[in-house]
């Protein structure tokens, strides 16, 4: 027995039924992507990172989900201390607030 057609990657098993006239076939099939690949064509890649290149996990669709304290398309921008002046403060680590020269205070304001 052979089956021809598109089967999208899924964790669920699909039941296929086939009647050849001589015999009746019923079988279960599933297609899964390789580790860290996602999407209908398994053509999206996401592997969790926590380094210079980004700080993220991956959701069930292969989208990057930033770790707490990080943001941006690659989750490599730190979220500064709440209230940190966007004009006179900045940070490279989450929750930090580093002041520009000439500015001071908890929020560099």
């Amino acid at each position: 027995a052979s089956h021809s057609g598109m089967i999208n990657p899924s964790r669920q098993w699909q039941t296929l039924k086939q009647n050849t006239g001589v015999a009746h076939f019923e079988y279960q099939i599933r297609v899964t992507c390789d580790d860290y690949y996602y999407g209908f064509g398994c053509n999206k890649f996401c592997r969790p990172r926590d380094d210079f290149f980004g700080h993220y996990a991956c959701d069930q669709n292969g989208n990057k989900t930033c770790m707490e304290g990080w943001m941006g398309p690659e989750c490599n921008r730190a979220i500064c201390r709440q209230g940190c002046s966007p004009k006179h403060g900045s940070c490279k680590l989450p929750g930090d607030c580093r002041c520009q020269y000439g500015w001071q205070g908890l929020y560099c304001d």
Epitope: F45, F52, F53
Partner: antibody, heavy 116, light 107 residues
Framework: QVQLVQSGAELKKPGASVKVSCKVS????????IHWVRQAPGQGLEWMGI????????KYAQKFQGRVTMTVDTSTSTAYMELSSLRSEDTAVYYC?????????WGQGTLVTVSS | DIQMTQSPSSLSASVGDRVTITCRTS??????LTWYQQKPGKAPKLLIY???ILDSGVPSRFSGSGSGTDFTLTISSLQPEDFATYYC?????????FGGGTKLEIK
């Protein structure tokens, strides 16, 4: 569309420094890191380093440590690569490239010739 | 640093041939591998990223496979425009080293 446009060819003497620029357009400059890659005549590709355009942090290949400086000017969406103490072996085409999962976009290349 | 061993360094083939280029890494890089094509006087062109994902606009005769330390670039049926030099590169950790290249020539 995304473009990376590099500065023109340079002829330098041994011991001098060279600064190559890479002006980008077509996307938010600080969203993507910029890498620098070089290729000596008839040779393969050599990765030199990466700069995080948002923070200005850079990481260099060991071979270039102490001789290379990568910087950015976010106001003009331009990345720079400066190589000092030039020697004849530094004669190469220098490329800037954008990306995280490989380099989909490259500059046109800048030929740097080091000769006395 | 992660070492990249690309083979063969040169290869002669004919239009219509199936060609395979391999890249081996000195340590596990998962699927952080990219393949490029370069023609003389031009910047490299991205073909495949994350070991097996075809970049947009790249013909389907190109395919990539492998993970861990062993990777393959396959061209199923060579076309005249495919004669060029091919490079692999890892993007797992710094430095992002390249393989030595494979020059694909017309037989």
């Amino acid at each position: 569309q995304v473009q990376l446009v590099q500065s023109g060819a340079e002829l330098k003497k041994p011991g001098a420094s060279v600064k190559v620029s890479c002006k980008v357009s077509g996307y938010a400059f600080t969203d993507y890191a910029i890498h620098w890659v070089r290729q000596a005549p008839g040779q393969g590709l050599e990765w030199m380093g990466i700069i995080n355009t948002y923070y200005g942090d850079s990481k260099y290949a060991q071979k270039f440590q102490g001789r290379v400086t990568m910087t950015v000017d976010t106001s003009t969406s331009t990345a720079y690569m400066e190589l000092s103490s030039l020697r004849s072996e530094d004669t190469a085409v220098y490329y800037c490239a954008r990306g995280y999962d490989g380099f989909a976009y490259w500059g046109q290349g800048t030929l740097v010739t080091v000769s006395s | 640093d992660i070492q990249m061993t690309q083979s063969p360094s040169s290869l002669s083939a004919s239009v219509g041939d199936r060609v395979t280029i391999t890249c081996r890494t000195s340590e596990n890089i998962y699927s952080y591998l990219t393949w490029y094509q370069q023609k003389p006087g031009k910047a490299p062109k991205l073909l495949i990223y994350n070991a097996k994902i075809l970049d947009s606009g790249v013909p389907s005769r190109f395919s990539g496979s492998g993970s861990g330390t062993d990777f393959t670039l396959t061209i199923s049926s060579l076309q005249p425009e495919d004669f060029a030099t091919y490079y692999c590169q890892h993007h797992y950790d710094i430095p992002w080293t390249f393989g030595g290249g494979t020059k694909l020539e017309i037989k």
